[in-house]
Each structure stands twice: as structure tokens, then as C-alpha cells.
């Protein structure tokens, strides 16, 4: 079976890697253009140079191609907490990140936000915080894990998941009660 | 099948407040981030607001920030958005939504929307 090709798959493919088909003249393979560079016009003929023309400032391409234009350069997402990691360049994009003792949480393929990492204040850490995942917490006894923050067993209340890991306390305290009545 | 369905939405003051509710199935809740996601007459949509699968993580655009509250119960498979402090800019119909994208607002579910009516 033959894979399905895309047409411009298929115009590529008939070329040796680094050259296009001419798209109006099928039996002419035109150089592709370097990565910082963009096709202005194609080759004229076969062995002759195709146009290309450095990106401008605030565009780029990060590999060799024969697009009619530069990418334009990402901007940093201020509202979801992003930085700078590095300026886009001709050749590069904009890198973005977080800043330190923050990490990652994306809402979608390409979104992420940044948030400040767990201190597991009341326990300790078993997992440290890493660039996509909070700092993973264990609680010290009389405390347990809510939304990765360790609370006292003071809080827990009977209809909550901590019930299993603070009943100690729970039947400590029943019993204090208890004794105090007879 | 997936399903999700709003309600909660009406007509309210300026000033006032409405809780929005969010009821999931046909797919396993707890594991996803879930989104609120709203268009206002004649508009684009908005992205509204998010919640990580257990609700560390919150976002809010600068236009509800401090006005709304997104939140969600794992084991009613419900997602809410209590909404204070309402002024005209937020009638809009609001969607909830499912799915991580290739960008904000490109989503894999959707449900049927709930009207929100500031007016006096």
C-alpha cells in the first residue's frame, strides 16, 4: 500500500532533499531557501539561484522552505504569567517560560500559564517541582493534602476523601470528648 | 457520548450575581481541564475562564478577574462559574467546554449554552 500524499508532499517528493518543484514548471527543482530566509521568486531555470530574501525584523523561519513569508514571532502571554526566555531572531522564535520556582500548567497545546510551586509548608516534598509539574507534597501526621496544600485535620470534615487519613485524630478527639463525659 | 449542559443563566441587575452549572457525562471529568467560554450578541468569543482536572490551577480573563469564580465538583461531574458583581459587558451566551486545543478557543466539546442578561 502507498501512503496518501499531499500535493505539495507529492511536488517536494519528486525533488532531491533541499530543492521544490517549480510550481509552474514541473520539470524544474529549485534550491530551497535557508532557515532566516524566505522565497521572493522562484529559480528561473534548472541550476539557477532561487530569489531569497532575509525575514524581517518581528518574523522568521527556523528551517530551510520556500514559504512567500516569514513566520510571525510569538509574543510572551504577560496574562498567564509568561517571560522571555530568548528574543526571536531570523532564524528562531520567540522562547517563552516561566520564571524560576514556577512551572507550567497548559490549557491547550500551545497555552501554557505559569504558576509559583508548591513549599509543601506542613510536610515534604517528595517530588520536586519540575518545568510542567508542581512540587508533589507529603503531609506531615495531623495534616493532609488539599489541593496540594497540606491542611490541618482540624478541617477535615466527615464528607471529605481526608477522613480516611485523619481518622487518628478524629477518633482521638471523639474520645477525649468521650472520657470528658463520664 | 459526550455531553455537557449548562444552566443557571437569566436576567439579573447591574450589580447583581448568578451561579452557572455545568453538568458533564460520557466522559471521565476529573481528567481534564475544563473551560468557560462566552459570546456576546454581534461578538466574537470570549475565553471566559479555566480550571485544571483538580482545580489547583485556575485562570481568569482581565475582564471577569476578581469578579468571577470558577470551580468544580469531581464527583458530581459538574463544573460552576459563580459570577458577582455583574455589569452590562457580561450579557453574553456561556458555553462550557472540554478538550485541550491547538490554541485558546478550539475545543473538543461544547455544550448548548446558557443566556446571561445584564440589564436594569
Known amino acids: 500500500l502507498v501512503p496518501h500524499l499531499g500535493d505539495r508532499e507529492k511536488r517536494d517528493s519528486v525533488c532531491p532533499q533541499g530543492k521544490y518543484i517549480h510550481p509552474q514548471n514541473n520539470s524544474i527543482c529549485c534550491t530551497k531557501c535557508h532557515k532566516g530566509t524566505y522565497l521572493y521568486n522562484d529559480c528561473p531555470g534548472p541550476g539557477q539561484d532561487t530569489d531569497c530574501r532575509e525575514c524581517e525584523s518581528g518574523s522568521f523561519t527556523a528551517s530551510e522552505n520556500h514559504l512567500r513569508h516569514c513566520l510571525s514571532c510569538s509574543k510572551c502571554r504577560k496574562e498567564m504569567g509568561q517571560v522571555e526566555i530568548s528574543s526571536c531572531t531570523v532564524d528562531r522564535d520567540t522562547v517563552c517560560g516561566c520564571r524560576k520556582n514556577q512551572y507550567r500548567h497548559y490549557w491547550s497545546e500551545n497555552l501554557f500559564q505559569c504558576f509559583n510551586c508548591s513549599l509543601c509548608l506542613n510536610g515534604t516534598v517528595h517530588l520536586s517541582c519540575q518545568e510542567k509539574q508542581n512540587t508533589v507534597c507529603t503531609c506531615h501526621a495531623g495534616f493532609f493534602l488539599r489541593e496540594n496544600e497540606c491542611v490541618s485535620c482540624s478541617n477535615c470534615k466527615k464528607s471529605l476523601e481526608c477522613t480516611k487519613l485523619c481518622l487518628p485524630q478524629i477518633e482521638n478527639v471523639k474520645g477525649t470528648e468521650d472520657s470528658g463525659t463520664t | 457520548e459526550v455531553q455537557l449542559l449548562e444552566s443557571g443563566g437569566g436576567l439579573v441587575q447591574p450589580g447583581g450575581s448568578l451561579r452557572l452549572s455545568c453538568a458533564a457525562s460520557?466522559?471521565?471529568?476529573?481528567?481534564?481541564?475544563m473551560y468557560w467560554v462566552r459570546q456576546a450578541p454581534g461578538k466574537g468569543l470570549e475565553w471566559v475562564s479555566a480550571?485544571?482536572?483538580?482545580?489547583?490551577?485556575?485562570y481568569y480573563a482581565d475582564s471577569v478577574k476578581g469578579r468571577f469564580t470558577i470551580s468544580r465538583d469531581n464527583s458530581k461531574n459538574t463544573l460552576y462559574l459563580q459570577m458577582n458583581s455583574l455589569r452590562a459587558e457580561d450579557t453574553a451566551v456561556y458555553y462550557c467546554?472540554?478538550?485541550?486545543?491547538?490554541?485558546?478557543?478550539?475545543?473538543?466539546?461544547w455544550g448548548q449554552g446558557t443566556l446571561v442578561t445584564v440589564s436594569s
Open positions: 467546554a472540554e478538550g485541550m486545543g491547538s490554541d485558546a478557543i478550539t475545543f473538543d466539546y
Open positions: 460520557g466522559f471521565t471529568f476529573a481528567k481534564y481541564n
Open positions: 480550571i485544571s482536572p483538580k482545580g489547583q490551577q485556575t
